[in-house]
Interface confidence: medium
Amino acid sequence: TQNKALPENIKYGIVLDAGSSHTSLYIYKWPAEKENDTGVVHQVEECRVKGPGISKYVQKVNEIGIYLTDCMERAREVIPRSQHQETPVYLGATAGMRLLRMESEELADRVLDVVERSLSNYPFDFQGARIITGQEEGAYGWITINYLLGKFSQKTRWFSIVPYETNNQETFGALDLGGASTQITFVPQNQTTESPDNALQFRLYGKDYNVYTHSFLCYGKDQALWQKLAKDIQVASNEILRDPCFHPGYKKVVNVSDLYKTPCTKRFEMTLPFQQFEIQGIGNYQQCHQSVLELFNTSYCPYSQCAFNGIFLPPLQGDFGAFSAFYFVMNFLNLTSEKVSQEKVTEMMKKFCSQPWEEIKTSYAGVKEKYLSEYCFSGTYILSLLLQGYHFTADSWEHIHFIGKIQGSDAGWTLGYMLNLTNMIPAEQPLSTPLSHSTYV
């Protein structure tokens, strides 16, 4: 009789990333008999939920059910029915919900409660919805990219999966930028830390890692823009704000009540003699850069070295993967190439920001104006954060790799989160097993 390949036993997992600006659902799959191997889990689908972040549903919680329906139904289609009941579903909420919780714990709990009730209605193994900490967000992002890059694998490869992958086992640092927070996570050269709050110890696949991480709440790109506007309107002589971070000719009316809605602008809040003001773009990168730098307090540091706002930052070490909005923004601006130097990026940002708004709208006709209008600010903010905030230099810039996906899986915290919660990252190196019918070579 002829040998038939046995059907592969596949497992699935679902993670919802409830971010400040939107929610995305990720479906992962892996061969069951290899779940302790490194690099076998991969993303099969991303479903972007139509609508804003869940924190925006605070006044209309009864709409959360319909909000999540399409993506949950998509998961039902993608995952075989026989697997539904054993497929875990996790929802992790990030900085948007951290901010809502700061305003009202009761309201944040109410949103999460309705989310949990909605997700419990599906035939999957729902494992709960929670607000993850900034430290977790940083750590899981670091685990994700290093898992996907094969950095935890003890097998040395004779080939390279992705352009920036090297055969050495030095881990990549992780730079994550969201709408409401940003995270930096890496293994510093010096294992002793001056700040225990920023220290994490992992044992993964038989190796110890001493990791530095910090999450800067309110320093995601959207909240940073609100901060900048709140800071700048303080010194405006009237209800016109001439803003160098928007293109010449751009105009937008902002409600003062919207500006002060977020806890991130509290430190700049003041009584203004108007209810609205108009942003008038003047498109000047250098001035925008100066304005952004005022958001970073670098005058105080109780450690040997700080990032900003008195937060410890050890000397940067090794290569870094910059993902989420770091990638989205730089990719839009066509600045993700490894060959583009920091000086060239700055030069291109100067050119981009100075382009008239009407010209920009014509050049990028398919892009929604809300986003299009903010790329000048976002690009400038990214440069400021990386160079002045985290102390990258023109030389170390080449160690930053702007990453969207690695081998088809999105870079971000969700995969690391699932790997941890499903116990798929063993502390010790698994014993090698004989080759099975489904072995990947």
């Epitope: 971010g19 600006s21 939107h22 972007r48 139509k50 609508g51 804003p52 972040g53 319909i66 329906t69 399409d70 139904e73 709408g179 790109k221 909005a325 989205f328 923004v329 990719n331 839009f332 892009v367 929604k368 809300k370 986003y371 976002s378």
Partner: nanobody
């Protein structure tokens, strides 16, 4: 610009049925979420039922099993079939079309259209 016009409301006895229609003057095919809301005197407007572009539906607990939402994109119309009506269903019923555009960095609310409302009275 989408304009919504509701019809089908009226006076009905408890236990009776009504079918509300919401006709859109523009193309609703591109709009993902179509919903029915209602507002009784002195109460806040509440979501009754919603349907997505893919045909997935959601209902308020109070109407589950009694009301059915459907949409016919070829006719640019959304329907609400209301059976086993009760006195507490008495309200002005509004049709709503809402959607968010997708972009690289997260969605942006773009459409939020409301009809003028149609009165439903359940009384013996």
């Amino acid at each position: 610009e989408v304009q919504l016009l509701e019809s089908g409301g009226g006076l009905v006895q408890p236990g009776g049925s009504l079918r509300l229609s919401c006709a859109a003057s523009g193309d609703i095919f591109s709009i993902n979420y179509m919903s029915w809301y209602r507002q009784a005197p002195g109460n806040e407007r509440e979501l009754v039922a919603a349907i997505t572009g893919r045909g997935n539906t959601n209902y308020a607990d109070s109407v589950k099993g009694r009301f059915t939402i459907s949409r016919d994109n070829s006719k640019n119309t959304v329907y609400l079939q209301m059976n086993s009506l009760r006195a507490e269903d008495t309200a002005v019923y509004y049709c709503n079309a809402w959607d968010y555009s997708d972009a690289d960095e997260g969605p942006l609310r773009e459409y939020d259209y409301w009809g003028q409302g149609t009165q439903v009275t359940v009384s013996s």
